[in-house]
């Protein structure tokens, strides 16, 4: 092809070419053309016959005016037609006449400010018509029934003012699984709007100045329809009361959005109408008080998103939001509760109470004054299967012995990015028989005891990220109870002693992180008593982060039980020569992560195990000797492995001898070199 | 095969009340594939339209600008038919009138009634 | 609102094509039926979206339509094919516009 269209499995993308005709020179059988992004101001038929297979145009982004009903007459089995924004602004009823097999039809972002006719009349099979982002007045597509099987019709973004019977009524015969009417200026819903389409199951009015009037009016007109989705977002409904959805309760729909509202008073039985609701969207509003009776009636809903929905109004404590005890209880079915980003003042006794199948609760940056978890903090949720609790950024900085003994079916605990300073008694988890994973990274210190995790055995994920953790190393280990545990991360704590038995007997972990710690003496030779073996017995490890720990030296067996190892990260440090066997045991190594270290030589007796089955490798900034002796075997390896080494030319730079100073470590000649074969 | 019979008075006086009803045999007036309209041609003249009925989820109808004062075109479900009324008629609404079927989407006439001379004279 | 004009008559010699057009502003995005109306008889369609041929219509007939004219064609015209033909289309609100008529005369 002349043109620089990409071809790839019948697929041609000419896209931001700057062309200004069709090319002419791809591949007949093609089945999806991309001419989007370039200068096209027609699109001529006769351009198209040699592409009769296309099933698929997109000639978005253009400067197209006029379309000439051919087109589709040469491109008999086109499904999806993608014409946004172009300068399209009369459709006849010939445009699309011969385009019978359309699925989708994409006119969003053009110039077409009236509906002329039944342009699209002909378009039995389309499912998808997308309108949106044009100067649309109204709803008027036609004159008579048609697009009997449309699903999708998008009008966001036009001018339309008014919904009326007379308009939507060519959608007797369809089932809209969305009307999308977001951001017009909607101002009336006349009497049997909604009725005219033969089934309507999402409607979206985002960005719809309604207020609760005009919301009411709405709710009574979408009465007796098959309305299933309702979204509402920021319709200025800043309050409501138990008329607002009273239309709603001859429907069945199952979800709402009413987020972005500024939503500021939810009065008593607001919802009371939607016993079917599933998914409820609040989030973003502004609630000064959530009385007892807010929610009642909602007893389906099984997610609710109240982020960043109780908000203060000003400094002053007074104007704090409020939550009634009880507020949830009508919620019997909620399974998923996300309550971040709040300003709520605590957690009372029965705030969470009768919510009997809660199993994801987010409280993360919930509380304006959670400073401490007492053993009566999550009362309230002793009934709650809770499987999932999100407690980040809250500022707590103490947790009371039996704190979520409450908790007994909780599998997943965050407390991360918190103020958490103490000593872990162990007491603080008591009661937690399921839990899976503690998340207490990103804390201000956390000192450790033999007993900090022995009630909590079925463990399998601990994190302790940047905690500045004490007694890692003390005796018998903190971690010795946690014999399920798979994944552990003791990173960013400056750890610079531990035991050769802290991590015995964790035969299933998986990943351990210990980077950005301060272990280099642990393996010195010079070290009193000897290195420390403390990857021994580690038998199923898969992931290893040793990264910026200072390391100078390895001990030859120190690896010797990860017969496992996947991963092994150990850049940034300060190795230079690695003992000859030392990766002979990792067979099933398949990236090493040797970065930013000191290497000068990658020999084949310290590096061929590690490599043999290698998919990434990555030895950037090492000062490489590029000599026969210290790279040859690694330059022959280079040129023949399949192995992804990133930045090879760029960042494998030779430091010596001072005549190949900053030369490329693969351009490296070896021809001269014996006994350098990478394979044998 | 579908067949449209005209009936009403030939000869009406200046300012009464013009009425013609059209019956149909082998379609439905309340077809959501085609419409209803009526046609005059005046004494040696040309086609006029005059007015059109559809049904969707009710009825519609549109009107020609000249009459659109005077006329309505009903259907009568019941009876399978449609009407033309014309108010005010004076000499000028003589005219042989025509019933016809429109056929979607386009709205071209497939099938027509015989025609009805209206004299309108006292 | 689109308008329709068409030439008041055009005559033909039996057996050789006759040409009636009907133009009208972009004529060519409409589309535009032809009915044949003989003396004392209500009007039939001869042709409907520019070129379709409703059945037992001859194949004489024939329909073209693009730029601001239509056109009907009837090759090899017979002595009954003398009759006044009508152009037509729709556009809404004014479900239809008739063009004033050709009165063909077969010579």
């Known amino acids: 092809s002349t043109t620089k269209c990409t071809v790839s499995h019948e697929v041609a993308d000419c896209s931001h070419l700057k062309l200004t005709q069709v090319p002419d020179d791809l591949p007949t059988n093609i089945t999806v053309l991309n001419l989007t992004h370039n200068q096209l101001r027609r699109l001529p038929a006769a351009n198209f016959t040699r592409y009769s297979q296309l099933t698929s145009l997109d000639v978005g982004f253009n400067t197209i005016s006029k379309l000439e009903p051919e087109l589709c007459q040469k491109l008999p089995m086109l499904k999806v037609l993608n014409l946004q924004h172009n300068e399209l602004s009369q459709l006849s009823d010939k445009t699309f006449a011969f385009c019978t097999n359309l699925t989708e039809l994409h006119l969003m972002s053009n110039s077409i400010q009236k509906i002329k006719n039944n342009p699209f009349v002909k378009q039995k099979n389309l499912i998808t018509l997308d309108l949106s982002h044009n100067g649309l007045s109204s709803t008027k597509l036609g004159t008579q029934v048609q697009l009997e099987n449309l699903q999708e019709l998008l009008l966001s973004n036009n001018k339309i003012q008014a919904l009326k019977s007379e308009e939507l009524d060519i959608f007797a015969n369809s089932s809209l699984k969305k009307l999308e009417l977001s951001s017009n200026q909607i101002k009336e819903f006349s009497p049997g709007c909604f009725h005219a389409i033969g089934r309507l199951f999402g409607l979206f009015l985002n960005n719809v100045q309604l207020g609760p009037s005009l919301t009411e009016k709405l709710c009574l007109e979408l009465a007796n329809t098959s309305i299933r989705n309702l979204s509402l977002s920021n319709s200025q409904l800043s309050t409501t009361s138990n008329t607002t959805f009273l239309g709603l309760k001859w429907t069945n729909l199952t979800m709402l959005d009413l987020s972005y509202n500024n939503l500021n008073v939810v009065g008593n039985d607001s919802f009371a109408w939607l016993p079917q609701l599933e998914y409820f969207f609040l989030e973003y509003n502004n609630i000064q008080h959530l009385f007892s009776h807010s929610l009642h009636g909602l007893f389906n809903v099984r997610y609710l998103n109240l982020k960043r929905s109780f908000t203060k109004q000003s400094i002053s404590l007074a104007s704090l939001p409020k939550i009634d005890d009880f507020s949830f209880q009508w919620l019997k079915c909620l399974e998923h509760l996300n309550m971040e980003d709040n300003d709520i003042p605590g957690i009372k006794s029965n705030m969470f109470t009768g919510l009997i199948n809660l199993k994801y609760l987010s409280l993360s940056n919930s509380f304006t004054s959670l400073r401490t978890l007492t053993n009566e903090t999550f009362v309230s949720l002793a009934h709650s299967p809770l499987h999932i609790l999100n407690l980040t950024k809250n500022k707590i900085s103490k947790i009371e012995s039996d704190a979520f003994s409450w908790l007994g079916h909780l599998e997943v605990l965050d407390l991360g990015l918190n103020e958490i300073g103490q000593e872990l008694t162990g007491q603080e988890w008591r009661g937690l028989e399921n839990i899976f994973e503690i998340y207490l990274s990103y804390n201000k210190y956390l000192q450790l005891t033999r007993n900090s995790f022995a009630l909590v055995p079925s463990l399998q994920r601990l994190m302790l990220r940047r905690v500045a953790l004490k007694n890692v190393d003390s005796s018998p280990s903190p971690f010795q109870p946690l014999r399920n545990l798979t994944i552990l991360d003791l990173s960013n704590n400056n750890i610079a002693n531990i035991n050769d038995d802290m991590l015995e007997g964790l035969e299933k972990l998986e990943i351990l992180d210990l980077q950005h710690n301060n272990l280099a003496r642990l393996w010195k030779h010079a070290n009193p008593g000897g290195p420390i073996y403390f990857l021994k017995g580690l038998s199923h490890l898969h992931i290893l982060n040793l990264e910026s720990n200072g390391f100078d030296e390895i001990p030859v067996e120190v690896f010797k039980d990860l017969f496992e190892l996947k991963i092994i990260d150990l850049g940034l440090n300060n190795l230079n020569t690695l003992p000859a066997s030392v990766f002979n045991n990792q067979v099933s190594l398949k990236s090493l992560n040797l970065q930013k270290n000191l290497i000068t030589s990658v020999e084949k007796k310290v590096f061929g195990p590690a490599f043999r089955n290698l998919t990434e490798l990555d030895m950037r900034f090492n000062p490489f000797d590029c000599t026969c002796e210290s790279i040859a075997w690694f330059v022959n390896w280079i040129n023949e492995t399949h192995t992804n080494i990133p930045e090879l030319s760029s960042h494998y730079l030779c430091n010596t001898p001072p005549h190949y100073h900053g030369f490329p470590v693969r351009l490296f000649d070896t021809s001269s070199c014996k006994d350098s074969a990478p394979f044998e | 095969q579908v067949e449209l019979q005209q009936s009403g008075p030939g000869l009406v006086k200046p300012s009464q009340t013009l009425s013609l009803t059209c019956a149909i045999s082998g379609d439905s007036v309340s077809s959501n594939s085609a419409a209803w309209g009526w046609i005059r041609q005046s004494p040696g003249r040309g086609l006029e339209w005059l007015g059109i009925i559809q049904k969707r989820s009710k009825w519609y109808n549109n009107y020609a600008v000249s009459v659109k004062s005077r006329i309505t075109i009903n259907p009568d479900t019941s009876k399978n038919q449609f009407s033309l009324q014309l108010n005010s008629v004076t000499p000028e609404d003589t005219a042989v009138y025509y019933c016809a079927r429109y056929s979607y989407p386009f709205y071209s006439i497939d099938y027509w009634g015989q025609g009805t001379l209206v004299t309108v004279s006292s | 609102d689109i308008e329709l004009t068409q030439p008041p008559s055009v005559s033909v010699a039996p057996g050789q094509t006759a040409r009636i057009s009907c133009s009208g502003d972009?004529?060519?995005?409409?589309?535009v039926h032809w009915y044949q109306q003989k003396p004392g008889q209500a009007p039939v369609l001869v042709i409907y979206?520019?070129?379709e041929r409703p059945s037992g219509i001859p194949e004489r007939f024939s329909g073209s339509n693009s730029g601001n004219t239509a056109t009907l064609t009837i090759s090899g015209t017979q002595a009954e094919d003398e009759a006044d033909y009508y152009c037509?289309?729709?556009?809404?609100?004014?479900?239809?516009?008739f063009g004033g008529g050709t009165k063909l005369t077969v010579l």
């Open positions: 972009n004529i060519g995005s409409y589309y």
């Open positions: 037509s289309s729709y556009d809404d609100p004014n479900f239809q516009v």
């Open positions: 979206e520019d070129s």
